[in-house]
């Protein structure tokens, strides 16, 4: 069947009315080799554009090749060429460029700061609960429980370094063995990839942008999940990570060295510590079954304290608790002994907003969560806008060619490995994989970086975060040096193993294909992105956690049938796409199942019903904000609302409600479901409140 014809513009100057229309056309010459390699698995998809109400639509000739939604957009340069500018114009242009750069760096700074505050907020909301996950004794015997605890704790505290440091202190104090700690570290690796997935959700306004951003973010998730899927059973069977790291740790005579360098933190800390400061030891203490820590607040009140070691008379249950008989005495009733007691004297209070409010941790956490998400969202929008205005025409071409083009033959294969090194290096500089991958996400969304290039950068980021951990381990005190180093090395070799599994051979780059698949679904049904986040990072881990607590028989009883069904579905799916003829007619497609079991359309209708009432106020709010935004920046159409809002306006127009026609439209991707019938997708199934 022929694809949808494109709608041309009868106006003499199309770009005058159709801003961003060109941005959706593929740049075939610039298309990277890697894109060619992997895209053959994708479903052909076509786009059409809705024009302003005053345009005349004319049919133009049908394109010979189908548009690929994964092609990078051409960012058209609408400005005057440099050579055509006068001296004043050139100076103005330079100042504009500098201004944009300063703004970009400023928003980037607040973006990173908001990620830090977001982590603090999550720790305040869920930190204590996360700490209690660790105090579960079943972790020792159940690697699956260890894995989900790693995921949940990292998701709740939004920081893999926090969960890793808890594990280190537990191993150092013999509450946990290295063997039991490895699955937790694997889980922490998965949990840390939620941050950039949340960041991707902020780009939900533009379908094509969201498709790329969400796929770019979830490529990290899929890499981690797939690595665990293969490497956890291997580790349980062979203990290779434990053995290899043990050999490395024992072969070196380490002296604890300098502290790991704080690079990005040097700039962000002065700001973030004015907002909130946390006493992260509290979570570790809860994890180590310290009852007193449960009543302590995570919000740091005293920043300058004086710790004095003094000998104090304390009561003990019996003479057996005395270090020596001569150091014990009685008051006639109780037995007393002399102990070295660390006495802490508070000298100066911290200088952050919440220091004198004495609010409960949950309240502070919720306040910071809302603020940091708003700042994160705002910064992201502004970063995308600034980048969008900077990366046009020639600049965009140069940048995209530099980032996405491979080395000349026969060294093309080296490009990806260089990207891994760049990712590792950049992560080492910013000291956080979350920050690096979150900064990468909007760049993927606006089409500066392809997913094929983002993938090795993300893998490098995984390596970079472990090198930071190794440095931190080498700087740790003697009593924790061995355990922290071994755990950091386990983390490092786990990521190396994952890369060896899912990167060297293009065929094995399964995370890219899976992320693209999820990107396509999420672009069409935007609620599915949130659904994915909840299921993969909360529901599945919590279910496994619950089943694990119930014991092995229950876990196996529920798990085996579920795994069997998943394998069955995957095998059937593979046969349907590769060799359907070997299957009976009924099994050649999923139509034998109820629609709700093989299509998201009915679910979309249900969700649209629920989200419908919220759509109108949301869109009104968006329009008001956009008007304000456009007034502030002085350009007539710098901001646009989501496609949902525009669909809503059209619906109202059809019912006779006069609404000002929107100025620009998103593209609509017609999926396989819609290709069967030549009609524009109805707003009910296409649009949700997301």
């Amino acid at each position: 069947m022929a694809p949808w014809p494109e709608l041309g513009d009868a106006q003499p100057n199309p770009s005058k009315y159709l801003e961003g229309a060109t941005s959706q056309q593929p740049i075939t010459p610039d298309k990277s080799k890697e894109t060619n390699k992997t895209d053959n698995t994708e479903v052909p998809v076509t786009k059409f554009e809705l024009l302003p109400t005053y345009s005349t639509a004319t049919l133009i000739e049908e394109p010979t090749e189908v548009d690929d939604p994964w092609n990078l957009p051409t960012l058209q340069d609408s400005g005057i060429k440099w050579s055509e500018r006068d001296a004043k114009g050139k100076i103005l242009c330079v100042f504009q460029g500098i201004g944009r750069l300063i703004l970009l760096l400023g928003f980037l700074y607040f973006f990173v700061c908001s990620l830090d505050v977001l982590s603090s907020a999550f720790q305040l909301v869920g930190g204590k609960m996360a700490g209690q996950f660790f105090s579960n004794s079943s972790i020792m015997s159940n690697p699956l429980l260890g894995l989900v605890i790693g995921v949940l704790v990292t998701v709740f505290v939004q920081s893999s370094s926090t969960s890793t440091s808890i594990v280190v202190s537990m191993v150092a104090s013999s509450l946990l063995t290295v063997r039991a700690a490895i699955p937790i570290i694997m889980g922490a690796n998965i949990g840390t990839s939620i941050t950039n997935t949340i960041v991707a959700l902020m780009q939900v306004g533009d379908r094509s942008e969201f498709r790329r951003a969400f796929a770019g973010a979830t490529v990290h998730d899929f890499f981690n999940w797939l690595s665990v899927l293969v490497l956890l059973p291997v580790e349980v069977a062979t203990h290779y990570l434990e053995v290899v790291t043990q050999l490395i740790v024992e072969s070196f005579h380490f002296k604890n060295g300098e502290d790991a360098p704080d690079l990005l933190k040097v700039i962000t800390k002065p700001f973030t510590k004015l907002i909130v400061q946390l006493d992260k030891k509290v979570i570790s203490q809860i994890a180590m079954n310290d009852e007193t820590a449960k009543n302590k607040s995570l919000v740091k009140i005293w920043c300058k304290t004086f710790t004095n070691m003094t000998q104090m008379n304390v009561t003990v249950p019996s003479m057996a608790n005395c270090t020596s008989h001569s150091l014990c005495w009685t008051d006639g009733i109780q037995i007393w002994t002399m102990k070295n007691v660390t006495y802490k004297e508070n000298i100066a209070k911290c200088q952050h907003i919440f220091v004198n409010f004495h609010l409960p941790d949950l309240a502070v956490g919720i306040i910071l969560l809302i603020i940091s998400l708003l700042v994160l969202c705002g910064c992201l929008i502004m970063i995308v806008k600034i980048l969008g205005s900077v990366l046009k025409g020639q600049v965009a071409t140069v940048i995209k060619k530099t980032i996405n083009t491979d080395f000349p033959f026969p060294f093309a294969w080296l490009t990806g490995y260089l990207a891994i090194l760049v990712g590792a290096g950049m992560t080492f500089i910013v000291q956080s994989s979350s920050v690096f991958t979150s900064a990468l996400t909007p760049l993927i969304g606006i089409g500066v970086i392809t997913i094929e290039r983002a993938y090795p950068l993300t893998l490098g980021s995984n390596i970079g975060t472990t090198t930071t951990a190794i440095l931190a381990a080498l700087a740790s005190p003697g009593n924790t040096l061995r355990s922290s180093l071994q755990i950091a090395l386990c983390h490092f070799f786990f990521n190396i193993s994952g890369i060896l599994l899912w990167y060297p051979i293009p065929f094995t780059r399964l995370p890219i294909r899976m992320a693209k698949g999820l990107g396509n679904i999420s672009a069409k049904y935007r609620w599915f992105a949130v659904f994915y986040l909840i299921i993969f990072f909360f529901l599945i881990p919590l279910t496994v956690f619950g089943l694990s607590l119930a014991g092995w028989p229950v876990l196996v009883g529920v798990g085996v049938p579920v795994v069997f069904i998943i394998i069955l579905v995957l095998c059937l799916r593979l046969l349907q796409s590769r060799c359907p003829r070997v299957l009976p007619k009924k099994l050649q497609n999923w139509n034998f199942l109820p629609l709700c079991m093989h299509s998201l359309k009915p679910w979309d209708a249900v969700i649209s019903k629920f989200t419908g009432p919220f759509q109108m106020p949301c869109c009104c709010c968006c329009r008001v904000c956009c008007r304000v935004c456009c007034l502030l920046c002085g350009c007539p159409k710098c901001c646009r609302c989501s496609k949902c809002c525009q669909d809503l306006e059209e619906g109202q127009e059809a019912q006779g409600v006069p609404v000002k026609a929107p100025e620009t439209f998103d593209n609509i991707t017609i999926s396989r479901e819609a290709q069967g019938e030549v009609r524009a997708p109805d707003s009910k199934t296409e649009c949700t409140a997301l």
Partner: antibody, heavy 119, light 107 residues
Framework: QVQLQQPGAELVKPGASVKMSCKTS????????MHWVKQTPGQGLEWIGA????????AYNQKFKGKATLTADKSSSTAYMQLSSLTSEASAVYYC????????????WGQGTSVIVSS | DIVMTQSHKFMSRSVGDRVRITCKAS??????VAWYQQKPGQSPKLLIY???TRHSGVPDRFTGSGSGTDFIFTISNVQSEDLADYFC?????????FGAGTKLELK
């Protein structure tokens, strides 16, 4: 200043019981242990036991277990010792003494109650 | 029970003399030892605790020394008002025990 007041003498018949008091003032009654000490010319000073008025916890010398019962009344800041099934050996001077906080030295002593067991 | 042995029942000294009263514990009591003075017809009075620490209001002519099992109580410049019985007491473990006492007399 710290004061511990005890009645001067108690005359009791053999087999009977006696409950002697020790009224305190000048300090917080519930913060220090109250010890009871027996003094006889032949045996010297013997520790009977102690009570912590704060929670009523007691400790006894094995020799006096079952013979002496220590109690304390926080409202009147008074400590009591009851001696039961008295014999002539129980004839002695009984002191109440305040224990120093955190150890077993006794810093303030009552004047002592002289118990005479006689038929 | 820990037995506290005061080897001298009586000690005779002139005013201005120095007197050393000894006390031996049957086992190690660290420094959990107190010294008391009891004048005729009066209740005991605390002089020294923790083997060496003078109680408040006690003149500095009274000193204590020793640790473990051997303890010494010294009056460096005997005064007439110092005539009394002197007891040692251990509070290393229950039951608390006292020495039999040493009577200081004037020559």
């Amino acid at each position: 200043q710290v004061q511990l007041q005890q009645p001067g003498a108690e005359l009791v018949k053999p087999g009977a019981s006696v409950k002697m008091s020790c009224k305190t003032s000048g300090y917080t009654f519930t913060t220090n242990n109250m010890h009871w000490v027996k003094q006889t010319p032949g045996q010297g000073l013997e520790w009977i036991g102690a009570i912590y008025p704060g929670n009523g916890a007691t400790a006894y010398n094995q020799k006096f277990k079952g013979k002496a019962t220590l109690t304390a009344d926080k409202s009147s800041s008074t400590a009591y010792m009851q001696l039961s099934s008295l014999t002539s050996e129980a004839s002695a001077v009984y002191y109440c003494a305040r224990g120093m906080y955190g150890h077993g030295a006794m810093d303030y002593w009552g004047q002592g109650t002289s118990v005479i067991v006689s038929s | 029970d820990i037995v506290m042995t005061q080897s001298h029942k009586f000690m005779s000294r002139s005013v201005g003399d120095r007197v050393r009263i000894t006390c031996k514990a049957s086992q190690d009591v660290g420094t959990a030892v107190a010294w008391y003075q009891q004048k005729p017809g009066q209740s005991p009075k605390l002089l020294i605790y923790w083997a060496t620490t003078r109680h408040s209001g006690v003149p500095d002519r009274f000193t204590g020394s020793g640790s473990g099992t051997d303890f010494i109580f010294t009056i460096s410049n005997v005064q007439s008002e110092d005539l009394a019985d002197y007891f040692c007491q251990q509070y290393s473990s229950n039951p608390l025990t006292f020495g039999a006492g040493t009577k200081l007399e004037l020559k």
